[in-house]
Interface confidence: low
Amino acid sequence: VEVQVSEDPVVALVDTDATLRCSFSPEPGFSLAQLNLIWQLTDTKQLVHSFTEGRDQGSAYSNRTALFPDLLVQGNASLRLQRVRVTDEGSYTCFVSIQDFDSAAVSLQVAAPYSKPSMTLEPNKDLRPGNMVTITCSSYQGYPEAEVFWKDGQGVPLTGNVTTSQMANERGLFDVHSVLRVVLGANGTYSCLVRNPVLQQDAHGSVTITGQPLTF
């Protein structure tokens, strides 16, 4: 028996359902009573889901997995993972045994988009050209860690005096806070871009300083 899986990682958004595709080619006369199907975590060999002795043995992994029972006889051994979490990320092995056996691994990459950045300025009044100001760009609930880029109004990258911190919450999602310290010109726009490297999703925020008032 030959097992086939997707070579590309499966990208799943947090809290959505993901399908880890796995298939085999059943011989003529194949019956489910002959099938042993095991899904396990590749690294730790922890059992995730199994089909043995002619029946679905159910989820062994937080009760969020399911097979496609009506499609098994056709050779579809795919696994449905519900309400994906950050901690689900990793490699899963599909092991199929009928008379002989084969296995293959598929990778799950979890992702979550970052929110539109909010911009704050300190100090936020009585600003004068030549003043040092701190601009903070905050974006929330993304995964994996973000790439943060700052640019001025002419699109020139600002790399000096930038401090970026990213903190994971209890769900493993990151809140990113990037701080730019800059000396004000006569006027100017400062923009931050928060990029999710997996989703290639960009979230933009900007602040324009034109004396008074401020534009966000």
Epitope: T44, V86, T164, M167, A168
Partner: antibody, heavy 122, light 108 residues
């Protein structure tokens, strides 16, 4: 063989500085989160700092060292660093370099160095 | 910050006996818990992660259980090399990563 080897510890006066290094070998250093964990004499383990694999190397610090310690990495040299400034007596400890199991976030640490001793005393 | 409380502080047992070590979290950490073993003069060694999964090379006499706020490390039959200090560590909410205060398993 997967290995971490710390160096740079020693005796320093309060207010002084030290830079610890951790040389990694036997694995792809750039693929792993790395951390520093310390252990004061006769005490338990205390997490100090961690650094992510990429995206500029996002850094994390315990409140007790924030603003004084700086973690960094040089993936081309397979080396992790901890720059320690404004040292205090309570920073006296064995400092361990550790590799995280996960490339994506701090979880559990499966490879540890042998530790390097930092003593802050006048 | 999540506080981990280990008990007992010291466990005095004989080789061959069963050791049960407890770790309690100040709030739920789901199953995001690891256990480490440390012998005098040595670095910690990862034993268990994700509450129940043994790290590579760890004998099956070590097992972990629990979820939420209550966790247990069990050593089914103590061997001479198992006498050491054991630490739990959570990674559910970080920074900071936090460790328990440790349980010393000593020879009775």
């Amino acid at each position: 063989e997967v290995q971490l080897l710390e160096s740079g510890g020693g005796l320093v006066q309060p207010g002084g500085s030290l830079r610890l290094s951790c040389a990694a070998s036997g694995f792809t250093f750039s693929d792993y989160y790395m951390s520093w964990v310390r252990q004061a004499p006769g005490k338990g383990l205390e997490w100090v700092s961690s650094i992510s694999i990429s995206y500029g190397g996002t850094t994390y610090y315990a409140d007790s060292v924030k603003g004084r310690f700086t973690i960094s990495r040089d993936n081309s040299k397979n080396t992790l660093y901890l720059q320690m400034n404004s040292l205090r007596a309570e920073d006296t400890a064995v400092y361990y370099c550790a590799r995280d199991r996960s490339p994506y976030q701090c979880r559990s640490m499966d490879v540890w160095g042998q530790g390097t001793t930092v003593t802050v005393s006048s | 910050e999540i506080v981990l409380t280990q008990s007992p502080g010291t466990l005095s047992l004989s080789p061959g006996e069963r050791a049960t070590l407890s770790c309690r979290a100040s709030q739920s950490i789901r199953s995001d818990l690891a256990w480490y073993q440390q012998k005098p003069g040595q670095a910690p060694r990862l034993l268990i992660y994700n509450t129940v999964t043994r790290a590579t090379g760890v004998p099956d006499r070590f097992s972990g259980s629990g979820s939420g706020t209550e966790f247990t490390l069990t050593i089914s039959s103590l061997q001479s090399e198992d006498f050491a200090v054991y630490y739990c560590q959570q990674y559910n909410s970080w920074p900071p990563l936090t460790f328990g205060g440790g349980t010393k398993v000593e020879i009775k």
